[in-house]
Interface confidence: medium
């Protein structure tokens, strides 16, 4: 078992109201018909994506304001990789293959995206950060 994610001491997280009504396996949290896993160790963006895929998931695809707010709360002050990346000569793409449609602003000038409770930004993909996976309910 990878264990549960320990939120930083300076941040309090309340479980969303629908989190208990889920079809998610142990160590995963259900929200808005998706299962989420928040890592307890740090990896590069690519290694994190590989870790997600081993569980039939991808780095988190954020496709609604509710999801965004949920993940920012969950991430707290720590930086977490999510599934948005820009390959040279290509548009920003989510880890599910969808082109990003600029519905939120990504700061920074690097190629891989992370979030924390106050921002969504980009960083060099080789940096080791916590990460968030998601996949649809079974």
């Amino acid at each position: 078992s990878v264990g549960q994610y320990n939120c930083p001491g300076q941040y309090t997280f309340s479980m969303p109201s629908d989190s208990h009504v889920s079809s998610c396996s142990e160590d995963w949290v259900g929200y808005q018909r998706k299962c989420y896993f928040i890592s307890t160790v740090k990896r590069s963006w690519t290694s994190a994506q590989n870790a997600c895929s081993e569980h039939g998931a991808t780095l988190a695809v954020i496709d609604s304001e509710k999801d965004m707010n949920f993940l920012k709360r969950y991430a707290g002050r720590e930086e977490h990789w999510v599934g948005l990346k820009k390959e040279p000569g290509h548009p920003w793409k989510w880890s599910n293959g969808k082109e990003f449609n600029n519905w939120f602003n990504v700061t920074g000038s690097d190629k891989c995206v992370f979030l924390k409770n106050t921002e969504v930004s980009s960083m060099e993909c080789e940096k080791n950060l916590y990460w968030i996976c998601n996949k649809p309910y079974k």
């Epitope: 496709d63 609604s64 304001e65 548009p91 293959g97 969808k98 082109e99 990003f100 449609n101 600029n102 519905w103 602003n105």
Partner: antibody, heavy 106, light 108 residues
Framework: VQPGGSLRLSCAAS????????MHWVRQAPGKGLEWVSS????????YYADSVKGRFTISRDNSKNTLYLQMNSLRAEDTAVYYC??????????WGQGTLVTVSS | DIELTQPPSVSVAPGQTARISCSGD??????VYWYQQKPGQAPVVVIY???KRPSGIPERFSGSNSGNTATLTISGTQAEDEADYYC???????????FGGGTKLTVL
């Protein structure tokens, strides 16, 4: 307005934090389909235009007044349409203005 | 840039299922939204993000998108669903947006 003339449209927004959202103008010629016209980022740092209006129309916003603008110059008959302002969020234009009819004719 | 193609009209009997297609090159790699527009009114989004339904939109509206085709499905079509329907998406880099030509849905 007559061909070659100018006009400025405004769109007053309320009920949400205006500066946080990308805003767009979309138009619809009488009896025709929807046509995207222009967009502007929340901070006004990025603006984009359809080829059909590039160089003639200018989109802007005043976040202190929660207002979106479209300055239309060198108007043509084919610019005749109902112009809608619309908020863009996640993956759709989720809120639309009621529309303003602009008629360009001599 | 991407072009979206819709059938000009679709007819369906009340209670039956209506399907409206929207095709474009590699459309499945982008998110698609669908609007309903009734005469004299502004468009209303009925599906966004390929298949998500805004609150207040009846469950009979659903959407899908894969390959080169997105589809709006209205199950158990009602007379009030008679309207023009437009699909929409965005170009690479989301620097512009494009709409299909619209489909007039007639409930017989």
């Amino acid at each position: 307005v007559q061909p070659g003339g100018s006009l400025r449209l405004s769109c007053a927004a309320s009920g949400f934090t205006f500066s946080n959202f990308v805003m767009h103008w979309v138009r619809q010629a009488p009896g025709k389909g929807l046509e995207w016209v222009s967009s502007i980022s929340g901070s006004s740092s990025s603006t984009y235009y359809a080829d059909s209006v590039k160089g003639r129309f200018t989109i802007s916003r005043d976040n202190s007044k929660n207002t979106l603008y479209l300055q239309m110059n060198s108007l043509r008959a084919e610019d005749t349409a109902v112009y809608y302002c619309a908020r863009y969020y996640y993956a759709s234009f989720d809120y639309w203005g009621q529309g303003t009819l602009v008629t360009v004719s001599s | 840039d991407i072009e979206l193609t819709q059938p000009p009209s679709v007819s369906v009997a009340p209670g039956q299922t209506a399907r409206i297609s929207c095709s474009g090159d590699s459309l499945g790699s982008k998110y698609v939204y669908w609007y309903q527009q009734k005469p004299g009114q502004a468009p209303v989004v009925v599906i966004y993000g390929d298949s998500k339904r805004p609150s207040g939109i009846p469950e009979r509206f659903s959407g899908s998108n894969s390959g080169n085709t997105a589809t709006l499905t209205i199950s158990g079509t009602q007379a009030e669903d008679e309207a023009d329907y437009y699909c929409g998406s965005y170009t690479t880099g989301a620097k512009s947006h494009v709409f299909g030509g619209g489909t007039k849905l007639t409930v017989l």
